[in-house]
Amino acid sequence: EEELQVIQPEKSVSVAAGDSATLNCTVSSLIPVGPIQWFRGAGPGRELIYNLKEGHFPRVTPVSDPTKRNNMDFSIRISNITPADAGTYYCVKFRKGSPDVELKSGAGTELSVRAK
């Protein structure tokens, strides 16, 4: 049995330009200790979308449902979506360290943007 699961329930999300997109992510355990970060794209060229501890992400808001008993919710909402936001978004769990070590990624959610 896996010690940690990172679950992105939606494979894809379609949003009209100008609207907000909610990207869902739940994690089965806080252990191992370490942060959750969101990225667009995979590999070395991926773009950091949200990191709770550092950086300025004015269009991104955490929208967790803290009532979830069996999982930790680390979902985000991106406001004022534009075509440039299209791509696949990954919720990634890190293990705390110096530096933090990437541990597990969700399967990804593809965001497509429709014309208004």
Partner: antibody
Framework: EVQLVESGGGLVKPGGSLRLSCAAS????????MSWVRQTPGKGLEWVAT????????YYPNSVKGRFTLSRDNAKNSLYLQMNSLRAEDTAVYYC???????????WGQGTTVTVSS | DIVITQSPASLAVSLGERATISCRAS??????????MHWYQQKPGQPPKLLIY???NLESGVPDRFSGSGSRTDFTLTINPLQAEDVATYYC??????????FGGGTKVEIK
Amino acid sequence: EVQLVESGGGLVKPGGSLRLSCAASGFTFSSYVMSWVRQTPGKGLEWVATISSGGTYTYYPNSVKGRFTLSRDNAKNSLYLQMNSLRAEDTAVYYCVSSMTGSSFDYWGQGTTVTVSS
Amino acid sequence: DIVITQSPASLAVSLGERATISCRASESVDSYGNSFMHWYQQKPGQPPKLLIYRASNLESGVPDRFSGSGSRTDFTLTINPLQAEDVATYYCHQSSEQLPWTFGGGTKVEIK
């Protein structure tokens, strides 16, 4: 019904060792993060150690790091705390605690008393 | 370490009245909208029992006269109305990413 039954407490001299055990039943032990929390009249509740569901990751506060070792046997539904180089300040009631998500301490055993004294 | 200051240390409240306990953390225990502060009840001779998880969520089987609120550094446990069986010591506990996890010093609730 969740049951956590601790054993192995007792009187030990400073510098000595003890091994605490916790027998779990009533839930899927291998899916739960497990911890030990201790309680002293003077210091209240103090987190002692935590282990991930599969046993890969362990965490300790500085007060016990290097002296205490937490392990688990999921096949036996058992949790173990090996305590070495015991000090008077380790005297406490030790509780075995289960946690579904590693966040809150969901279920507590009745505790076992450890006394470190010469 | 995140230090949790719990107040008051003891509290005497009349039956049927409201009891309010506060915990203040030395730094935020929030992450992604989750507040990693929890509340426990301990009666004499018994282990602690989880009442409220993540600041405001009532654990299954806990009466709804117990409620929790707060975020970031300031949290409150409210018992309303207080009943005789609520006489106990109450503890808060933070489980943020910042180790070690720590507890408040406890609040002993008695009947006035």
